[in-house]
C-alpha cells in the first residue's frame, strides 16, 4: 500500500530573468527512492537517479541546475517558463508518487512564494 505523501513548494512566482528552486519532499513512507524525474508539462527536464546521479536534458542544460538535494533550480526565467512542473518519485517497493508545482514568471517585481501544500 502506498502510504507516502509528496510535499511541494506549491504555487510559486518569480521574476523574469531571475531563478527559482523547485522542491519536493516525500514523507510518511519507508520506501527507497530510486529516481526522481522533473517534468514541465510534456517535457522531461531532468532525472536524478540514486546510482547514476543527475541527467539534465541537453535542451535545458543552460538554464537548469541540479539541486539542492533532489530539487531543481531554474535560471534565467522567461514568461514562457510559466506553467506546471511535476516531480515524479520512483520508489521501491511503493511505486510512483507525483507532486505538482505551479510557477508563474512575472514581468514586475511583485513575486511571492505560495504556501506549502500536500498531495496525497
Amino acid at each position: 500500500m502506498m502510504t507516502g505523501t509528496i510535499e511541494t513548494t506549491g504555487n510559486i512566482s518569480a521574476e523574469k530573468g531571475g531563478s527559482i528552486i523547485l522542491q519536493c519532499h516525500l514523507s510518511s513512507t519507508t520506501a527507497q527512492v530510486t529516481q526522481v524525474n522533473w517534468e514541465q508539462q510534456d517535457q522531461l527536464l531532468a532525472i536524478c537517479n540514486a546510482d547514476l546521479g543527475w541527467h539534465i536534458s541537453p535542451s535545458f542544460k543552460d538554464r537548469v541546475a541540479p539541486g539542492p538535494g533532489l530539487g531543481l533550480t531554474l535560471q534565467s526565467l522567461t514568461v514562457n517558463d510559466t506553467g506546471e512542473y511535476f516531480c515524479i518519485y520512483h520508489t521501491y517497493p511503493d511505486g510512483t508518487y507525483t507532486g505538482r508545482i505551479f510557477l508563474e514568471v512575472l514581468e514586475s517585481s511583485v513575486a511571492e512564494h505560495g504556501a506549502r501544500f500536500q498531495i496525497p
Partner: antibody
Framework: EVQLLESGGGLVQPGGSLRLSCAAS????????MSWVRQAPGKGLEWVSA????????YYADSVKGRFTISRDNSKNTLYLQMNSLRAEDTAVYYC???????????WGQGTLVTVSS | DIQMTQSPSSLSASVGDRVTITCRAS??????LNWYQQKPGKAPKLLIY???SLQSGVPSRFSGSGSGTDFTLTISSLQPEDFATYYC?????????FGGGTKVEIK
C-alpha cells in the same frame, strides 16, 4: 568501453527451454536497468522483459509472462533470460540492452538467435 | 498497452534529401520517446532519446521533436550511411513498445 555479449541461443523444440546470458563489461553493471528485446526474422523490434539495477523489480511483455524469467547476477556482471515452454513464435534474435535512467537503451549486444522448431 | 504508429513504413530518398519520419502514440507519453537506427544484420543504435536529446556520437543532422502523442525524426541532409530502418519506442510505461519501423531506401 561498454560491451554486451549475448550467448545461449540455438535450436530448440516447441515446449523446450533455453537460457540466454548477456555478459556486460565496461560499466558499473549494478547501476543500470537492463532489457531483453527480440526481433523475429524480417520483423520489427519487440520488447520482452526488463529488470532494475538491483534486480528487485522485473517487467514482462504479455506474450512471455509466465514462461520467461529475467534475472541478473551483479557479482558476475551478467543478465539472464530463462525461457520455458517455447513456441514457434518465440523464434527471433534476442538482444540485451542497457537502460540508463530506465528510459532509453543506449548500448545493445550483437544478438543471439533462438530458433524454435521441430 | 500504448500503441506506437510510425509513418511512412518505407520511403525512397536521395543523398542530400531532408527526410522526416513521424511516430504517433495512442496516448500521451510526455517526452518519453526514443529513436533507433538499425542496419541489416546489426543491433539497433540509439539516435535520439527523450524526444529531442541527441545521443553522444550521433551526427547533428539527426534531430527529434514533439511531445505528448506526436513525434518527428528528421534527417536534415541524408547521407549514404543513413539508409537503414528507423524505429521509435515509448518508455513512458511498461510494456515498452516500438513502432513498426520505417525503411529508408535509396531512390
Amino acid at each position: 568501453e561498454v560491451q554486451l555479449l549475448e550467448s545461449g541461443g540455438g535450436l530448440v523444440q516447441p515446449g523446450g527451454s533455453l537460457r540466454l546470458s548477456c555478459a556486460a563489461s565496461g560499466f558499473t553493471f549494478s547501476s543500470y536497468a537492463m532489457s531483453w528485446v527480440r526481433q523475429a526474422p524480417g520483423k520489427g523490434l519487440e520488447w520482452v522483459s526488463a529488470i532494475s539495477g538491483s534486480g528487485g523489480s522485473t517487467y514482462y511483455a504479455d506474450s512471455v509472462k509466465g514462461r520467461f524469467t529475467i534475472s541478473r547476477d551483479n557479482s558476475k556482471n551478467t543478465l539472464y533470460l530463462q525461457m520455458n515452454s517455447l513456441r514457434a513464435e518465440d523464434t527471433a534474435v534476442y538482444y540485451c540492452a542497457r537502460e540508463p535512467y530506465d528510459y532509453w537503451m543506449d548500448y545493445w549486444g550483437q544478438g543471439t538467435l533462438v530458433t524454435v522448431s521441430s | 498497452d500504448i500503441q506506437m504508429t510510425q509513418s511512412p513504413s518505407s520511403l525512397s530518398a536521395s543523398v542530400g534529401d531532408r527526410v522526416t519520419i513521424t511516430c504517433r502514440a495512442s496516448q500521451s507519453i510526455s517526452s518519453y520517446l526514443n529513436w533507433y537506427q538499425q542496419k541489416p544484420g546489426k543491433a539497433p543504435k540509439l539516435l535520439i532519446y527523450a524526444a529531442s536529446s541527441l545521443q553522444s556520437g550521433v551526427p547533428s543532422r539527426f534531430s527529434g521533436s514533439g511531445s505528448g502523442t506526436d513525434f518527428t525524426l528528421t534527417i536534415s541532409s541524408l547521407q549514404p550511411e543513413d539508409f537503414a530502418t528507423y524505429y521509435c519506442q515509448q518508455s513512458y510505461s511498461t510494456p515498452l513498445t516500438f513502432g513498426g519501423g520505417t525503411k529508408v531506401e535509396i531512390k
